[in-house]
Interface confidence: medium
C-alpha cells in the first residue's frame, strides 16, 4: 500500500511538472522544503530544490538509471549535511539505501527557529524591495516564499504559492508606480484570511 501511494505521488508530480513547468515545480519545492526544513538556510533549500528538480525531471522522462543515481546522491548529500538541514533526519539516514530516499521524502517537519524576525522588514519596509526584485526576480520571490513557508507549516503549499503570486503581482504593479513603497506598503494585509 505504501508503495502504491508513493507511486501515485510520483505520477502526480510528473503530471504537475509536465503541465505547469519547471518554474512552478521549483516554487512548490521551495515552499514544501522550507516548511519541512525551517532551520535550513535559504542557500541550502535552494540547492536541495535544484537537485530535487533534476531528480524529478529525470524520473519523469524515464531515465530510470540516472533517476536512481541522482536520488541516491541527493539522499547521501542530505544525510551528510543533516546538521544544517534538519534534526528529524537521523532515523532516515540510518536506514538502508533503498529505504532512505522514501523515508526522507516523508520526514516530519522540523521545529521552527524560535527567534525569526518579522517578514515585513525585508519584504515591505526595506527601501531596497524594488531594486532587489528587479535584479533577481526569481531569487527574491524564492526567498520570500522560503521565509513565509518556514513560518507557516500550517499553511497548504497551494495557499503559500497563491500568497507568493499575490506578492509578485503587487511588486510588478507597484515597482512601476510613482511611489512604490506607498503602493506595496499594505501588501501583507491582503494575506490575512
Amino acid at each position: 500500500d505504501e508503495g502504491k501511494a508513493s507511486s501515485a505521488k510520483q505520477r502526480l508530480k510528473c503530471a504537475s511538472l509536465q503541465k505547469f513547468g519547471e518554474r512552478a515545480f521549483k516554487a512548490w519545492a521551495v515552499a514544501r522544503l522550507s516548511q519541512r526544513f525551517p532551520k535550513a538556510e535559504f542557500a541550502e533549500v535552494s540547492k536541495l530544490v535544484t537537485d530535487l528538480t533534476k531528480v524529478h525531471t529525470e524520473c519523469c522522462h524515464g531515465d530510470l538509471l540516472e533517476c536512481a543515481d541522482d536520488r541516491a546522491d541527493l539522499a547521501k548529500y542530505i544525510c551528510e549535511n543533516q546538521d544544517s538541514i534538519s534534526s528529524k533526519l537521523k532515523e532516515c539516514c540510518e536506514k538502508p539505501l533503498l529505504e532512505k530516499s522514501h523515508c526522507i521524502a516523508e520526514v516530519e517537519n522540523d521545529e521552527m527557529p524560535a527567534d525569526l524576525p518579522s517578514l515585513a522588514a525585508d519584504f515591505v519596509e526595506s527601501k531596497d524591495v524594488c531594486k532587489n526584485y528587479a535584479e533577481a526576480k526569481d531569487v527574491f520571490l524564492g526567498m520570500f516564499l522560503y521565509e513565509y513557508a518556514r513560518r507557516h507549516p500550517d499553511y497548504s503549499v497551494v495557499l503559500l504559492l497563491r500568497l507568493a503570486k499575490t506578492y509578485e503581482t503587487t511588486l510588478e504593479k507597484c515597482c512601476a508606480a510613482a511611489d512604490p513603497h506607498e503602493c506595496y506598503a499594505k501588501v501583507f494585509d491582503e494575506f490575512k484570511p
Epitope: 535559504f42 542557500a43 535552494s46 526595506s126 531596497d128 532587489n132 535584479e135 526567498m143
Partner: nanobody, 125 residues
C-alpha cells in the same frame, strides 16, 4: 558549502589606502549578505561593514570607519570589496570576510554562516 577567500591585505602607512577583495565559490553568490569583520590582537572580533544581497546598495558601517571605508559588490564576479581610505594605526587587524543568508543585511557575527581565513592589514605610523 560556500568557500570564502580574502586578498589585498598588507602593510601601509597612516593616511594611505588599501582595497580588500573577498571572492566566494561553491554556491550561488546572489542570495548572500556579505560582511567584513576585523580582529586586532587581544581584542574581540568587531563588525566593520556589510552589504545586502541582490542590488547591493544597502550598506551598513561601524561608526569607527564611516566616511573612510566603502563596501561594494560585483555579483558577476562573486566578489565583495572593501575600499579603505585614510587608514589609521588603530585599523590594524586581521580582516575577515563572511557570508550570511539569514538576513538581507546584517551586522551580527552570529548571523554569518561562512567565514574566510582573513587577511592581515597593518597600518604603521
Amino acid at each position: 558549502q560556500l568557500q570564502v577567500v580574502e586578498s589585498g591585505g598588507g602593510l601601509v602607512q597612516a593616511g594611505g589606502s588599501l582595497r580588500l577583495s573577498c571572492t566566494t565559490s561553491g554556491r550561488a553568490f546572489i542570495g548572500y549578505a556579505m560582511g567584513w569583520f576585523r580582529q586586532a590582537p587581544g581584542k574581540e572580533r568587531e563588525f566593520v561593514a556589510a552589504i545586502s544581497w541582490f542590488a547591493g546598495d544597502t550598506t551598513d558601517y561601524a561608526n569607527s570607519v564611516k566616511g573612510r571605508f566603502t563596501i561594494s559588490r560585483d555579483n558577476a564576479k562573486n566578489t565583495v570589496y572593501l575600499q579603505m581610505n585614510s587608514l589609521k594605526p588603530e585599523d590594524t587587524a586581521v580582516y575577515v570576510c563572511a557570508a550570511s543568508s539569514a538576513r538581507p543585511l546584517s551586522s551580527r557575527s552570529d548571523e554569518y554562516h561562512y567565514w574566510g581565513q582573513g587577511t592581515q592589514v597593518t597600518v604603521s605610523s
